[in-house]
Structures are given as structure tokens and as C-alpha cells.
């Protein structure tokens, strides 16, 4: 999916009002310096591409993020403010087998959510030059 035509300001507002709080809740008890940010993005569409990938695609050691509250809210925000996103996801869902995932918090998941927080921060500051 091409995130170029999303309403970025509305997605930012949803992040600031609710998604960010859910990410903080997930990370509670973890020091902010515990993980290094290794994933970056260059502009808002790129940031959303990376956010979608890290949030919904299972990775080695962390298969369960999609069930978390921040992930569900991310999904809905993209569906509401990215034209055509719902249709592409509905079609993709119909083509694949339903997968039930258990919620398991591992250190790898905490690291992944830390990366997500960095991507969201970058998404919210699009005019900053890439380091």
C-alpha cells in the first residue's frame, strides 16, 4: 500500500491522543535508554510503511504485537485516514488463512515497540533533517 495520500495530520492527532499512551503502557518498566533505535524513516509515507511493517508483520522472537491495543488503534487510524487502505486490507485478509495469536511480551517485542516509538516520533517531526 502507498501511504502518500493519507491525512497525516489526523493520524498524528490520533497518535498523540491515544496510540502514544498505549505504547508507553506497553513499555512500562523499561528504561528509555535500554534499546538503540536501528530503524529509521525519511518522510511520512515511509514512516507509515515502516510502522505498518513493524506493527503487523511477525518477526523472529516477536509474533504477537498485532493484538496489542496500540496496534489495533494504528490499524483503525490507517483505515480511516488512508484512502483505499481498508479495501486493500479486506482483500488481503480474504486471501489468507486466519491466524490466532497469543499475546506474549518478550524482550524482543519490547525492543520492537521501542523502535516503533522512534518511528512515530519521526513521523510527527517530518521537517527534521535525517541524522
Amino acid at each position: 500500500y502507498d501511504f502518500t495520500n493519507c491525512d497525516f495530520e489526523k493520524i498524528k492527532a490520533a497518535y498523540l491522543s491515544t496510540i502514544s499512551k498505549d505504547l508507553i503502557t506497553y513499555m512500562s518498566g523499561t528504561k528509555s535508554t535500554e534499546f538503540n533505535n536501528t530503524v529509521s524513516c525519511s518522510n511520512r509515507p515511509h514512516c507509515l510503511t515502516e510502522i505498518q511493517s513493524l506493527t503487523f508483520n511477525p518477526t523472529a522472537g516477536c509474533a504477537s504485537l498485532a493484538k496489542e491495543m496500540f496496534a489495533m488503534k494504528t490499524k483503525a487510524a490507517l483505515a480511516i485516514w488512508c484512502p483505499g487502505y481498508s479495501e486493500t486490507q479486506i482483500n488481503a485478509t480474504q486471501a489468507m488463512k486466519k491466524r490466532r495469536k497469543r499475546k506474549v511480551t518478550t524482550n524482543k517485542c519490547l525492543e520492537q515497540v521501542s523502535q516503533l516509538q522512534g518511528l512515530w516520533r519521526r513521523f510527527n517531526r517530518p521537517l527534521l533533517k535525517q541524522q
Epitope: 493484538k67 496489542e68 491495543m69 489495533m72 490499524k75 483503525a76 488481503a92 485478509t93 490466532r100 495469536k101
Partner: nanobody, 118 residues
Framework: EVQLVESGGGLVQPGGSLRLSCAAS????????MGWFRQAPGKERELVSA???????LYADSVKGRFTISADNSKNTAYLQMNSLKPEDTAVYYC????????????WGQGTLVTVSS
């Protein structure tokens, strides 16, 4: 077996109100999104409102301030209160539920037609 059953659609005049209901059965998961989608003739299905198991809500700009989504967990039912209806709100409205995040809205109702016309 999971079932979502919508009710409350119909014909209403511009400026009028309707309340859609979506009764869910066979669902036991604690984390969820309950969403109301709509599809107008010749257009893509769009998510107009969503409510989450923590009570928070999101609305599309086209309905914000006019539509209110709510849920009664004890009845496993979601509602969409639609006020100040406009002809452009005419569509088939679907409720959908996403319980465990693995896919995009796993469970769908059959849809209920809302027609706004004088």
C-alpha cells in the same frame, strides 16, 4: 459460530436520525475493535467509526460531530447513533469486529441499508 447481526437501517429524511445496532455472538476475546464501515454504490468500503475495548473512539471527518459510536459489553452489542443525516450518508452500513489483530476485521455483518432522501 461467530455472528454479527445489524439492525436499524431504513429510509430517513435529510436532517433526520437513525440508530444502528450490531449484536455479536460467539465472541469471547477481551481486546477488540468494533467498527462501522459503509459502502455507497460504486464506491469503496470505508471505515467511518471505531470503538476499542478500552472505550476510546475514532471518527472519519465526514461523520465527526454527527455520528456517535458506543458499545455495551454486557450485551456484546455496538451502536452507531447517526444524527443530522445527509443524502451523501446513503450507503450499506456494515459492522465489523477485529478480535485478535491477526487480520483486518475478521468478522462482518451482512449489512443494513441506510437511505437518506426526501
Amino acid at each position: 459460530e461467530v455472528q454479527l447481526v445489524e439492525s436499524g437501517g431504513g429510509l430517513v429524511q435529510p436532517g433526520g436520525s437513525l440508530r444502528l445496532s450490531c449484536a455479536a455472538s460467539g465472541l469471547t476475546f477481551s481486546s477488540y475493535i468494533m467498527g462501522w464501515f459503509r459502502q455507497a454504490p460504486g464506491k469503496e468500503r470505508e471505515l467511518v467509526s471505531a470503538i476499542f475495548s478500552d472505550g476510546s473512539t475514532l471518527y472519519a471527518d465526514s461523520v465527526k460531530g454527527r455520528f456517535t459510536i458506543s458499545a455495551d459489553n454486557s450485551k456484546n452489542t455496538a451502536y452507531l447513533q447517526m444524527n443530522s443525516l445527509k443524502p451523501e450518508d446513503t450507503a450499506v452500513y456494515y459492522c465489523a469486529r477485529d478480535d485478535y489483530g491477526g487480520n483486518f476485521f475478521d468478522y462482518w455483518g451482512q449489512g443494513t441499508l441506510v437511505t437518506v432522501s426526501s
